[in-house]
């Protein structure tokens, strides 16, 4: 169990011509607030389910109007992280679905004006426990950068936050240096001691004793940068161990380049050598290419080979929007006829007809009366689907099968006596009254 | 797409209440709005009561301020609206309706994609 965080740092108009001023128009006041969507990104996801991993909103945004004329200012943001709680494991990879919604105040036509001005979508991978990771997105003319991180919660501890490390009533059980580890409780495990000297920041082991070095860097404890050639530094004192000069404290020194950048020395500075995905003067930008995954639902990435060139998603069938993330509503546009019910079964549409029609949508009308017999002289009226018998007299039913009573509704008037009859009724009228049915 | 269905409507006396539910199925993730419109017969269609899923803000129609009261349960897939003081001219066909929509204006029903068939209140003096 942990959380996922997500801190926005700014959200506005993107470099470059077109961008809009601010999100609010000058007439009406608006704030903005954000939700956030995770899913697993190595799973493909069901689009019903788009956050298996959790969602969250923030709160609202201070109310922003606007002033023409005057320089657009930052927009105010809302406060605090946005946080996502997570049950089960970490997943490591994970695809995320930033929406960026604007609620517009004041009085018009329709009422309050809600819109979703941007959404951003990527996939990440990001072990638990890590630092934050800084990302730069653009949707449109807007561009948001924010922070994340997925952090454990206590029991839980490492990289998935799978295992439990629980602290015990009675430490003293377990020997110096070894903690007390859930679910065994008279279990104690070691922590994991990496050689000695180490680099903390360049090294990190997996087994007791090795020191191994991330990118970007070298040597038996990880304090050399790759770009520094073999006892040819000219700074520091020299090693007992190698004859060489360790170097001293220079511009790479405690690696200022940010997710797995390698550091090489510049005659005024340095350089980082970013990993696919990220640049910047410290690879502290994330650019969204199409190694990223950004197309979801079977969407297929075009261009984009690298962060500064823009990506294309070409949807499926039933999917929209820049990610493929949004589901068409095919049943939207009516393609059923003559009542038919639409179901969007994703793969396909489905019409499901009224009774009388028939065809993929429903475009075919039946001859209800087709193979139907009106019994005793009926003949078949067609319409509405169904088929109807209109009976000849002195019978009814729906196949008028049935032999009608016709005195059964009190035809004769003013207290006449109504006698069957095999062409029909005969009306013996009161004294006084006469006609067909007694009416005069 | 989201498929609707309301219960609920009937006859009354002024002054009397009724509760209408209308539960959403299908890809409900999805919903931005859900609300109630309600037309009488020769009038226009009326936007009566609506919450906002996305933010669970609600907002009336000023003829039934301070009368009804909208609301939804924790799985966000059903609303229902509470008639309290009902008048003869609450009388009409009560429609569900639900947007998916990007952009929406909450009393405009060109903003929402889904619509249930109706339920009808009908309030006698």
């Known amino acids: 169990a942990g959380v996922f965080e997500l801190q926005i740092h700014s959200f506005g108009p993107g470099p470059g011509p077109g961008a809009p001023r601010s999100p609010c128009s000058a007439r009406l006041p608006c704030r903005l607030f954000f939700r956030v969507c995770l899913k697993p990104g190595l799973s493909e996801e069901a689009a019903e389910s788009p956050c298996a991993l959790g969602a969250a909103l923030s709160a609202r945004g201070p109310v922003y109007t606007e002033q023409p004329g005057a320089p657009a200012p930052d927009l105010p943001l809302p406060d605090g992280l946005l946080q996502v709680p997570f049950r089960d494991a970490w997943p490591g990879t994970f695809s995320f679905i930033i929406e960026t919604w604007r609620e517009e105040l004041g009085d018009q036509i329709g009422g309050p004006a809600w819109s979703l001005l941007a959404r951003v979508a990527g996939r990440r991978r990001l072990a638990a426990g890590g630092p934050w990771a800084r990302d730069i997105q653009r949707a449109g003319a807007w561009e948001l950068r924010f922070s994340y991180r997925a952090r454990c919660e206590p029991p839980a501890v490492g990289t998935a936050c799978t295992r439990l490390c629980r602290p015990r009533s009675a430490p003293s059980r377990c020997g110096p240096g070894l903690r007390p580890c859930a679910p065994l409780e008279d279990e104690c495990e070691a922590p994991l001691v990496c050689r000695a000297g180490c680099s903390p920041e360049h090294g990190f082991c997996e087994q007791p004793g090795e020191c191994r070095c991330l990118e970007g860097w070298t040597g038996p404890l990880c304090t050399v940068p790759v770009s520094t050639s073999s006892c040819l530094s000219p700074r520091g004192p020299s090693s007992a161990t190698t004859g060489c000069l360790v170097p001293g404290p220079g511009p790479c020194d405690g690696n200022p380049c940010a997710n797995g950048g390698s550091c090489s020395e510049t005659p005024r500075s340095f350089e980082c050598t970013c990993p696919r995905g990220f640049y910047g003067l410290r690879c502290e930008v994330s650019g969204v290419t199409c190694a990223d995954g950004p197309c979801f639902n079977g969407g297929l990435c075009v261009g984009g080979a690298d962060p500064d060139s823009a990506y294309i998603c070409h949807c499926p069938p039933g999917f929209q929007g820049s990610n493929c993330e949004k589901r068409v509503d095919r049943c939207s546009l009516q393609p059923c006829r003559n009542g038919g019910l639409c179901l969007d079964l994703g793969h396909a549409l489905r019409c499901r007809c009224r009774a009388g029609f028939a065809g993929p949508r429903c475009e075919h009308d039946l001859d209800d009366c087709a193979g139907r017999a009106c019994a005793n002289g009926g003949t078949c009226v067609e319409g509405g689907g169904a088929h109807r018998c209109s009976c000849a007299l002195g019978f009814g039913g729906r196949d008028c099968r049935e032999r009608a009573d016709p005195c059964a509704a009190r035809p004769c008037a003013h207290g006449g006596r109504c006698y069957a009859h095999f062409s029909g009724l005969v009306c013996a009228c009161a004294p006084g009254y006469m006609g067909a049915r007694c009416e005069f | 797409q989201v498929h609707l269905m309301e219960s609920g409507g009937g006859s009354v006396q002024a002054g009397g209440s009724l509760r209408l539910s209308c539960v959403a199925s299908?890809?409900?993730?999805?919903?931005?709005?859900m609300g109630w419109f309600r037309q009488a017969p020769g009038k226009e269609r009326e936007g009566v009561a609506f919450?906002?899923?996305?933010?669970?803000?609600?907002y009336y129609g000023a003829s039934v301020k301070g009368r009804f009261t909208i609301s939804q349960d924790n799985a966000q897939t059903t609303v229902y609206l509470q008639m309290s003081s009902l008048k003869p001219e609450d009388t009409a066909m009560y429609y569900c309706?639900?947007?998916?929509?990007?952009?929406?204006?909450?009393?405009?029903?060109?903003?929402?994609?889904?619509w249930g068939q109706g339920t009808q209140v009908t309030v006698s003096s």
């Open positions: 309706a639900a947007s998916t929509k990007d952009q929406f204006y909450v009393f405009n029903p060109i903003g929402y994609d889904s």
């Open positions: 299908g890809n409900t993730y999805r919903l931005n709005s």
């Open positions: 919450i906002v899923m996305i933010r669970g803000t609600t």
